[in-house]
Interface confidence: low
């Protein structure tokens, strides 16, 4: 039985030429996390695997930078960036969980960045 | 195409140390982690431990603690294994292998054979 | 350690046989994978995550299982099979090992 939630960033702004920490917490599972993929829509951005360390997908080694944590820094941002991340955490024994995170990248400076916790 | 090129075969003695290189090329170096494994002859294949190129993490078999060192050069896409105190049990075929998302090995090395004799 | 053990070491059989390996684990595994080694040559990836088979490997090769019990078949049995094969297992803790290899030999 899967019990547990992740808690994630939730919607947030960045502007644009600045970056962005995407970050999912899984809470509540004693389950072990093997793996946790970044995804863009249906693009691995990259992979943190528990044993093996960080995999960034060649096309974004650029603008991409493992953590801190289990999260992921988004550089260089554009108004392209704008849209959906997905945090899926992979774990033994529960099975798979993801998380939502909504990204809006501004070109004005009014940006707010908003975060449903503290990001360690 | 991705393709992992070993070091030649090499003679050690007992009490010695043989360092193996695995140039990598067709892909990313420093995106995928890159493993140790050996075959002595007639035996089954051994995981030795692994490097991860994009920060130089190392994990390592329990068995080769302490006598095994896993380095790499980014800018020569090169991964290097050290085996020291060498003994005639170390005589194998040592391979590198690329190591995929799912937790296996897609490309590997030609294998090094290192013999141990005095 | 997990110590996987495969079965048979060795077999003969013929062009056009059905044969199957097992490999089974002494705990319970998250991922099997199976390798394919000819003489001399390095081992190649040949089905990964118990059941996906790599690039250029036929269909007649197929894989299954679950927990500590793994299965390798060949439907039909071609000369270009002849060869040794490996289990190896990825569990949480390293180190993650490899089966002893079955040798698949012509009758």
């Known amino acids: 039985m899967m019990t547990g939630t992740i808690e994630t960033t939730g919607n947030i702004s960045a502007e644009k030429g600045g970056s962005i920490i995407l970050q999912c917490h899984l809470s509540s599972t004693t389950a072990q996390v093997t793996q946790v993929n970044w995804e863009q829509q249906d693009q691995l951005l990259a992979i943190c695997n528990a044993d093996l360390g960080w995999h960034i997908s060649p096309s974004f080694k650029d603008r991409v930078a493992p953590g801190p944590g289990l999260g992921l820094t988004l550089q260089s941002l554009t108004v392209n960036d704008t849209g959906e991340y997905f945090c899926i955490y992979h774990t033994y024994p529960d099975g798979t969980y993801t998380g939502r995170i909504f990204l809006e990248v501004l070109e004005s400076s009014v940006a707010e960045h908003g975060a449903r916790f503290q990001i360690p | 195409q991705v393709q992992l090129v070993q070091s030649g075969a090499e003679v050690k003695k007992p009490g010695a140390s043989v360092k193996v290189s695995c140039k990598a090329s067709?892909?990313?170096?420093?995106?995928?982690?890159m493993h140790w494994v050996r075959q002595a002859p007639g035996q089954r294949l051994e995981w030795i431990g692994y490097i991860n190129p994009y920060n130089d993490g190392t994990k390592y078999n329990e068995k080769f603690k302490g006598r095994a060192t896993l380095t790499s050069d980014r800018s020569a896409s090169t991964a290097y294994m050290e085996l020291s105190s060498l003994r005639s049990e170390d005589t194998a075929v040592y391979y590198c292998?690329?190591?995929?998302?799912?937790?296996?090995?897609?490309?590997w090395g030609q294998g090094t054979l290192v013999t141990v004799s005095s | 350690d997990i110590q996987l053990t495969q079965s048979p070491s060795s077999l003969s059989a013929s062009v056009g046989d059905r044969v199957t390996i097992t490999c089974r684990a002494s705990?319970?595994?998250?991922?099997m994978h199976w390798y394919q080694q000819k003489p001399g040559k390095a081992p190649k990836a040949w089905i990964s995550v118990t059941s996906n088979l790599a690039s250029g490997v036929p269909s007649r090769f197929s894989g299954s299982g679950s927990g500590t019990d793994y299965t390798l078949t060949i439907s039909s049995l071609q000369p270009e099979d002849f060869a040794t094969y490996y289990c190896?297992?990825?569990?949480?803790?390293?180190?993650?090992?490899f089966g002893q290899g079955t040798k698949v030999e012509i009758k």
């Open positions: 705990s319970s595994v998250n991922y």
């Open positions: 190896q297992q990825w569990s949480s803790n390293p180190p993650w090992t």
């Open positions: 292998a690329r190591w995929r998302v799912n937790y296996y090995f897609d490309y």
């Open positions: 067709g892909y990313t170096f420093s995106n995928y982690v």
